[in-house]
Interface confidence: medium
């Protein structure tokens, strides 16, 4: 088994606490609302949102994958950290066992925030990770972030 690690950083004009509340804690409700072209629904399969919770994320017709199942690994409300793993569906299968993701939202002096994202692809055997898969995952994350960010900018009363 191999582990391939990809790390990215992206910035947001939204303060860290507000972004964590909307993007992380209420993403299940917000993503289908603000980015229906990317995510059609998020369904809690088991758990209450804390570690061990399993969520099924369904994608609209026309996207490469029908769904993925995510497992929540850690939610740190104090340090704005969220760890989860993609454990079923989507790219998970013969060559890929799981994807472990870590997101940390850090406040910046200008009142915005930086999202530090780590994606660890756990492959089976000697398989490698396809560059297209990493790119698609990054683009999905960016789409969701910008959608949430724009929603928050337009609705100043939300998630304060």
């Amino acid at each position: 088994m191999g582990v391939f690690n990809y790390e990215t950083e992206t910035t947001s004009v939204i303060p860290a606490a507000r972004l964590f509340k909307a993007f992380i804690l209420d993403g299940d409700n917000l993503f289908p609302k603000v980015a229906p072209q990317a995510i059609s629904s998020v369904e809690n399969i088991e758990g209450n949102g804390g570690p061990g919770t399993i969520k099924k994320i369904s994608f609209p017709e026309g996207l490469p994958f029908k769904y993925v199942k995510d497992r929540v690994d850690e939610v740190d409300h104090t340090n704005f950290k969220y760890n989860y793993s993609v454990i079923e569906g989507g790219p998970i299968g013969d060559t890929l066992e799981k994807i472990s993701n870590e997101i940390k939202i850090v406040a910046t002096p200008d009142g915005g925030s930086i999202l530090k994202i780590s994606n660890k692809y756990h492959t089976k055997g000697d398989h490698e990770v396809k560059a297209e898969q990493v790119k698609a995952s990054k683009e999905m994350g960016e789409t969701l972030l910008r959608a949430v960010e724009s929603y928050l900018l337009a609705h100043s009363d939300a998630y304060n």
Epitope: N29, P32, K33, V34, A35, P36, Q37, S40, S41, P60, R146, A147, S150, Y151, L153, A154, H155, S156
Partner: antibody, heavy 119, light 111 residues
Framework: EVQLVQSGAEVKKPGESLRISCQGS????????IAWVRQLPGKGLESMGI????????RYSPSFQGQVTISADTSTRTAYLQWNSLKASDTGIYYC????????????WGQGTRVTVSS | SYELTQPPSVSGSPGQSVTISCTGT?????????VSWYQQHPGKAPRLMIY???KRPSGVSHRFSGSKSGNTASLTISGLQAEDEADYYC???????????FGGGTKLTVL
């Protein structure tokens, strides 16, 4: 094909109430914001407000807050725009339209409902 | 009420190009890649022509293109045809104002 079909033209008197409708088809109705857009005779487009049918989250543009009520029924895939007391100045064409993207664009548009308010 | 600024009218001869501008602020046009353009023929519903500044929906002619510089977005129609005669509206996502803003509209006349 994604489509929005609106109810027919209405002629009303000032002070009367009215509800016009917009039925969506060809897509997951509960997952997309619907906007209502007003066009007064010979004038431009004004966004009145938007609703997310999935949870009825509704946002009104300031000049329409308290003047109209926007609602939706996911079981019939229908959005509504309602007035409790019409004024002559409400005369115009009202379009329902699905919001796409972030949501940041309007597509497709309903055919429009002409509302005439006259004594 | 606040709206994006468009010229009331523009005109051009068949085959020519015309450009319609749409000026806002850094809170709307300049702040996002989220300007869209709509064509409206008399007595008809508007139709989406450009979204997210430069993208063209399927079915819209390549003669229509969008661009943006700073707080001003532009719609350019090349190779003007008689059927392009219509009203054109820009729209931008916005912050801190009514969150959905249309321009006042521009009447395009094909001479």
């Amino acid at each position: 094909e994604v489509q929005l079909v609106q109810s027919g033209a209405e002629v009303k008197k000032p002070g009367e109430s009215l509800r016009i409708s917009c039925q969506g088809s060809g897509y997951r109705f509960s997952n997309y914001w619907i906007a209502w857009v007003r066009q007064l005779p010979g004038k431009g487009l004004e966004s009145m407000g938007i609703i997310y049918p999935g949870d009825s989250d509704t946002r009104y543009s300031p000049s329409f807050q308290g003047q109209v009520t926007i609602s939706a029924d996911t079981s019939t895939r229908t959005a509504y725009l309602q007035w409790n007391s019409l004024k002559a100045s409400d005369t115009g064409i009202y379009y329902c339209v699905r919001l796409g993207g972030i949501p940041d664009w309007f597509d497709p548009w309903g055919q429009g409902t002409r509302v005439t308010v006259s004594s | 009420s606040y709206e994006l600024t468009q010229p009331p009218s523009v005109s051009g001869s068949p085959g020519q190009s015309v450009t319609i501008s749409c000026t806002g602020t850094s809170s709307d046009v300049g702040g996002y890649n989220l300007v869209s353009w709509y064509q409206q023929h008399p007595g008809k519903a508007p139709r989406l022509m450009i979204y997210e500044d430069t993208k063209r929906p399927s079915g819209v002619s390549h003669r229509f293109s969008g661009s943006k510089s700073g707080n001003t977005a532009s719609l350019t129609i090349s190779g003007l045809q008689a059927e392009d005669e219509a009203d054109y509206y820009c729209y931008s996502y916005a912050t801190g104002r009514p969150s959905r803003l249309f321009g006042g509209g521009t009447k395009l006349t094909v001479l």
